[in-house]
């Protein structure tokens, strides 16, 4: 098959996923496109353990994740259920703030300097994290 069995060069393996951490910024949609061309997606945080891992690698820098509400409800880019899933918003966030003067509200989620999440204008050029899952089939016994 085409499943990955090891992480690409310059990616970091953690808990059967591969992560790539940018060192420069792009708008959320452009970061999303970059990850997709890498056969990956913007990082989807599903646990406190994964949150701490990502936070450790990005440091105190605003960084996009794969969570947005551009079409209404909050959605993870890989289809992970938002309502029942892990969340780590800053107090009083998300607030869809309109006071920034850039037009519209705030529809894209990012890690803030303390790792907690905030919603912000999707056009801001923040760093980003791509994630791709390693072949889960290789971890399971073959079907008989």
């Amino acid at each position: 098959g085409s499943e990955r069995t090891c992480c690409p060069v310059n990616w970091v393996e953690h808990e059967r996923s591969c992560y790539w951490f940018s060192r420069s910024g792009k708008a959320w949609a452009d970061a999303d496109n970059y990850c997709r061309l890498e056969d990956a997606h913007l990082v989807v945080v599903t646990s406190w353990e994964e949150q701490k891992f990502v936070q450790h690698h990005i440091g105190p820098v605003n960084t996009w994740m794969g969570l947005h509400d551009q079409n209404g409800p909050w959605k993870w880019v890989d289809g992970t259920d938002y309502e029942t899933g892990f969340k780590n918003w800053r107090p009083e966030q998300p607030d869809d703030w309109y006071g920034h003067g850039l037009g519209g509200g705030e529809d894209c989620a990012h890690f803030t300097d303390d790792g907690r999440w905030n919603d912000d204008v999707c056009q801001r050029p923040y760093r980003w994290v791509c994630e791709t899952e390693l072949d889960k089939a290789s971890q399971e016994p073959p079907l008989l």
Partner: antibody, heavy 121, light 107 residues
Framework: EVQLLESGGGLVQPGGSLRLSCTAS????????MSWVRQAPGKGLEWVSV????????FYADSVKGRLTISRDNSKNTLYLQMNSLRAEDTAVYYC??????????????WGQGTMVTVSS | DIQMTQSPSSLSASVGDRVTITCRSS??????LMWYQQKPGKAPKLLIY???SLQIGVPSEFSASGSGTDFTLTISSLQPEDFATYYC?????????FGPGTKVDIK
Amino acid sequence: EVQLLESGGGLVQPGGSLRLSCTASGFTFSSYAMSWVRQAPGKGLEWVSVISGSGGTTFYADSVKGRLTISRDNSKNTLYLQMNSLRAEDTAVYYCARRIAVAGNDAFDIWGQGTMVTVSS
Amino acid sequence: DIQMTQSPSSLSASVGDRVTITCRSSQSISTYLMWYQQKPGKAPKLLIYAASSLQIGVPSEFSASGSGTDFTLTISSLQPEDFATYYCQQSYSIPFTFGPGTKVDIK
């Protein structure tokens, strides 16, 4: 040696179809996104389309959206460009190029020799 | 879409000359910029990526700089094989876009 070899160009009437191929050798084809870039006679470079290594993600220039389709067969190390509803302005040399991801940049580091597509009645 | 412009569109120079080509983007693209060289009848060749990093195998007479909207490609001492057309390309955003090119010919 890392190499890309295009084929399938030729003369076609307006409204006609053509399929370009690009065969890769010397590298792990499925690990790289691939792109098509074209150059009209005497003009500059125009990006046309890109496809991820698995083939699961594709993007197109607005000028070709709905008419040109990029695809790949990783078992054959081959990239394709299906060209339908061709127009005179599609006349160009078509290059396939390997896309590399470096420091968040998308660069084209390996190019084929190009194949000429002429749309004329 | 992000528009790329280049200046000059063409220039004449002699072997040994220092040549500078400018590329500008219609919006800030940070350092998501590449430079390519193309000779007549040949495919383009990647020279520079990430605005200032020299691609492997490219001679050290080529250098580049810039960030945001303004970028330059410099050939410190023009060699006979450097007479060609040079293109910049942005990869901040899809669609990827190229500049119109700068033709460097012999004076």
